[in-house]
Amino acid sequence: LEIKVNPPQDFEILDPGLLGYLYLQWKPPVVIEKFKGCTLEYELKYRNVDSDSWKTIITRNLIYKDGFDLNKGIEGKIRTHLSEHCTNGSEVQSPWIEASYGISDEGSLETKIQDMKCIYYNWQYLVCSWKPGKTVYSDTNYTMFFWYEGLDHALQCADYLQHDEKNVGCKLSNLDSSDYKDFFICVNGSSKLEPIRSSYTVFQLQNIVKPLPPEFLHISVENSIDIRMKWSTPGGPIPPRCYTYEIVIREDDISWESATDKNDMKLKRRANESEDLCFFVRCKVNIYCADDGIWSEWSEEECWEGYTGPDSK
């Protein structure tokens, strides 16, 4: 006799208004009498509709939460698993039950903002900027909302960057406990003449940090051939262990690059008689603190003052 189990009931994908953080929830299946003492597990698969691969979760819970790209639709499927001790060691699964979440198609794609860029400056404040949609009426204006785990609900930007009295960006500071978790943004718009398509963005703040450039550069030459360069980590909340540096050294007409995770470096001179010996440096958050980052601006150039020319004797 074939053992059968029903799929979960009421499987659905729910949008609680958190700009892409969705809830997938379901109810237990109707179970025949002989399996009522059994442990039920649920195999959940979900993805954005343009993705080739499913994320798979095995859980005993009745809800699962994750972040999605709301620019695209979402689909999920779930089935019940009966524990093997209930089924004489055989694997018993229900049929799949499916759910989907369709994106709003209000407003044409041309009304959606373009070139959304966000930078977390020195791990202190976030600046996002955008350009208006390709074809929008002159009365169109945009509004930015954001959410991350720890906020009760999505918040609107309170400090817009403006051009011609239109919102073209937003500055956010005091983002407490907002790194190392998904940060969700929605930019929607309004016009009296047409609906505006919303745009969704998700990232983690530590991956878009642009530090200040290193400062207090110093260069010296020891034994006439060993170049020693030092600099200070920029001020602010980024721990010194989180920086990686790129250094450009210029010796007369020759330049070369080097890299280090420390805030000093020793090199050999390429030519003993070089007259010009200078360097500059920039920094970025390293792989131990983030998956990605943005290079700082270059520091000012620092040159060795110790060389006084052939007539100095």
């Epitope: 009421d10 929830q25 237990p28």
Partner: antibody
Framework: EVQLLESGGGLVQPGGSLRLSCAAS????????MSWVRQAPGKGLEWVSY????????YYADSVKGRFTISRDNSKNTLYLQMNSLRAEDTAVYYC???????????????WGQGTLVTVSS | DIQMTQSPSSLSASVGDRVTITCRAS??????LNWYQQKPGKAPKLLIY???SLQSGVPSRFSGSGSGTDFTLTISSLQPEDFATYYC?????????FGQGTKLEIK
């Protein structure tokens, strides 16, 4: 404390419309399916409609199918019942009730509102 | 639709009595059966779910049993506040149905 408070009942003529509301508090609204159950004067309980937590699933009794629409606004913690083409036999006290499930799928109505009276009469 | 039939339709009893109300389903509903109590002018109150599970806060003198098509609600020792109408409800189908009710009156 779980609370359900119905409103929107009243006197309406046959063929008319009415929208009932049920304001919920004291629980995570989106996690629960919700039902409407009615009771005609001096009669027993009759289940009317059910909606799942996210609103994706709706079910109706045959007696109201095509005339009544159940909906919910999870941002407002509110359940609705839009009643169109009302008939004299729809006269009843309408209760909203929260649906819960046992771990093996047994569905039951564990909290009820106090009800709102709908009278359909000319 | 699954039909639910309760018996008796009404019943007289005294405080301290043991009372049993039965409910029969028109087809097997496993143990997907709930019992509710309703007092005049009040909303129904859940007593028993899944045939035999006592709802939180309900006195232990109430108990439920049965499976398949035949179910019983038992009140082991009637208290004055127990005089009310009792309804069974099947929850197997996505279209739940109630029994017609059993009115429990003071003898």
């Amino acid at each position: 404390e779980v609370q359900l408070l119905e409103s929107g009942g009243g006197l309406v003529q046959p063929g008319g419309s009415l929208r009932l509301s049920c304001a919920a508090s004291g629980f995570t609204f989106y996690s629960y399916g919700m039902s409407w159950v009615r009771q005609a004067p001096g009669k027993g309980l009759e289940w009317v409609s059910y909606i799942s937590g996210g609103g994706s699933y709706t079910y109706y009794a045959d007696s109201v199918k095509g005339r009544f629409t159940i909906s919910r606004d999870n941002s407002k913690n509110t359940l609705y019942l839009q009643m169109n083409s009302l008939r004299a036999e729809d006269t009843a006290v309408y209760y909203c009730a929260r649906g819960s499930y046992s771990h093996y799928g047994a569905h039951y109505l564990d909290y009820w509102g106090q009800g709102t009276l709908v009278t359909v009469s000319s | 639709d699954i039909q639910m039939t309760q018996s008796p339709s009404s019943l007289s009893a005294s405080v301290g009595d043991r009372v049993t109300i039965t409910c029969r389903a028109s087809q097997s509903i496993s143990s997907y059966l709930n019992w509710y109590q309703q007092k005049p002018g009040k909303a129904p109150k859940l007593l028993i779910y899944a045939a035999s599970s006592l709802q939180s806060g309900v006195p232990s003198r109430f108990s439920g049993s049965g499976s398949g098509t035949d179910f019983t609600l038992t009140i082991s020792s009637l208290q004055p506040e127990d005089f009310a109408t009792y309804y069974c409800q099947q929850a197997l189908s996505s279209l739940p149905t109630f029994g017609q009710g059993t009115k429990l009156e003071i003898k």
